[in-house]
């Protein structure tokens, strides 16, 4: 692989745990310039595997509120609007990064944390286990 | 209100941009102790709104690899295994936090960034607009 030279303007870290502890600019840059986050707002109702959104709140974490999807049914909604139990509603999960103050109550010291969140649900064909 | 005292073990920041720039411990704590991330690994094939996963790689970002979902069809797979265009496959999107090296190529200096990622797809009833 190509070795990219270290930028001479990089800040130095005197921290004894370096490089585990790094400097982070908290002024968030938003890359989603052409996106409209509202566009998927009603999928949870219109989906054949609809879901409810539950509030997961922790003031010591950033973001403090995370909305978690919980599938409404075990099965999926068919063309007649009924639940078809030959199909399964399953959560689509994703690991996301969050910030947590560490040590607690320190204004300028944080730790990255990885948490698994359910973003929505999808309808899948079940895996059928045949008993011999 | 009660004033919570600052933890005496808090690190100091000598950075000229402080307090926008803070110390973050990258030794990531994983809260997903009881979860099995593999359990949703085949949903992209079994879903009635199947998707392909595309590798989005950027060495200047953490995490450097993000998997992006792209729905395979405009419609959804019906019981016969055919695409039903009376239904729509749509991406479920979520905004996530990532770290970007800033200045570029610096090993210990980052900026928070927010990006929109497609996590998977779900099958929805279309919104029909009637023309007068």
């Amino acid at each position: 692989g190509i070795t990219i030279p270290r930028n001479p303007g990089c800040p130095n870290s005197e921290d004894k745990n370096f490089p585990r502890t790094v400097m982070v600019n908290l002024n968030i840059h938003n890359r989603n310039t052409n996106t409209n986050p509202k566009r998927s707002s009603d999928y949870y109702n219109r989906s054949t595997s609809p879901w409810n959104l539950h509030r997961n709140e922790d003031p010591e974490r950033y973001p403090s509120v995370i909305w978690e999807a919980k599938c409404r049914h075990l099965g999926c909604i068919n063309a007649d609007g009924n639940v078809d139990y030959h199909m399964n509603s399953v959560p689509i999960q994703q690991e996301i990064l969050v910030l947590r103050r560490e040590p607690p109550h320190c204004p300028n010291s944080f730790r990255l944390e990885k948490i698994l969140v359910s973003v929505g649900c999808t309808c899948v064909t079940p895996i059928v286990h045949h008993v011999a | 209100g009660i004033t919570i005292p600052r933890n005496p073990g808090c690190p100091n920041s000598e950075d000229k941009n402080f307090p926008r720039t803070v110390m973050v411990n990258l030794n990531i704590h994983n809260r997903n102790t009881n979860t099995n991330p593999k359990r949703s690994s085949d949903y992209y094939n079994r879903s009635t709104s199947p998707w392909n996963l595309h590798r989005n790689e950027d060495p200047e970002r953490y995490p450097s690899v993000i998997w992006e979902a792209k729905c395979r069809h405009l419609g959804c797979i019906n019981a016969d295994g055919n695409v039903d265009y009376h239904m729509n496959s749509v991406p479920i999107q979520q905004e996530i936090l990532v770290l970007r090296r800033e200045p570029p190529h610096c090993p210990n200096s980052f900026r928070l960034e927010k990006i929109l990622v497609s996590v998977g797809c779900t099958c929805v009833t279309p919104i029909v607009h009637h023309v007068a």
């Epitope: 908290l26 409810n52 | 009660i2």
Partner: antibody, heavy 124, light 109 residues
Amino acid sequence: QVQLQQSGPGLVKPSQTLSLTCAISGDSVSSSSAAWGWIRQSPSRGLEWLGRISYRSKWYNDYAVSVKSRITINPDTSKNQFSLQLNSVTPEDTAVYYCAREVDSMYYSYFDIWGQGTLVTVSS
Amino acid sequence: EIVLTQSPATLSLSPGERATLSCRASQNVWAFYLAWYQQKPGQAPRLLIYGASNRATGIPARFSGSGSGTDFTLTISSLEPEDFAVYYCQQYRSTLSLTFGQGTKVEIK
């Protein structure tokens, strides 16, 4: 362009119910990226957040502890508006009442659109 | 509940001067959930800054915000005649904890 238009009486008698309505144009009360709140302002209390409603597959109501036992905020999806009801009012509830849109994007929270304000006087 | 204390209560300055307004929280708040508003007599508050340092749409570059933890600052680099008003900071810690500071009045000297 999002706008909020407030309506309701400016005079309420002690022990009665204060009722205000906020009509939304340019956005939806059922939006999943916003919450809709009420804030009041008086010389004695300054700006005081009273509560909010937000829709995320169901309606969520959050109320300030100071008024929790007396307040109700309701949506009216058919008219795209929301209302405030504050029961058992006293002269201490005299204030300018504002409705506002709270941007609620998970990563930020702030009030970007405000109603024009309604001065409500509690007096017999 | 988190108390936001703004200082000074009144700031007397001339047009063209730099204004520095302080907002101190009784506990740590996430900078991402800290906002600043401007209010003129007879008007509703107007959003200036969100996320401690992001200017709202249409807000001139002379307004800037900074801070983290418990200490936040709003700076107006060079006061214009229309900037004389009352300024409020506001924090969101949780869905039930949302508070405003008592305000700083910037008046013409």
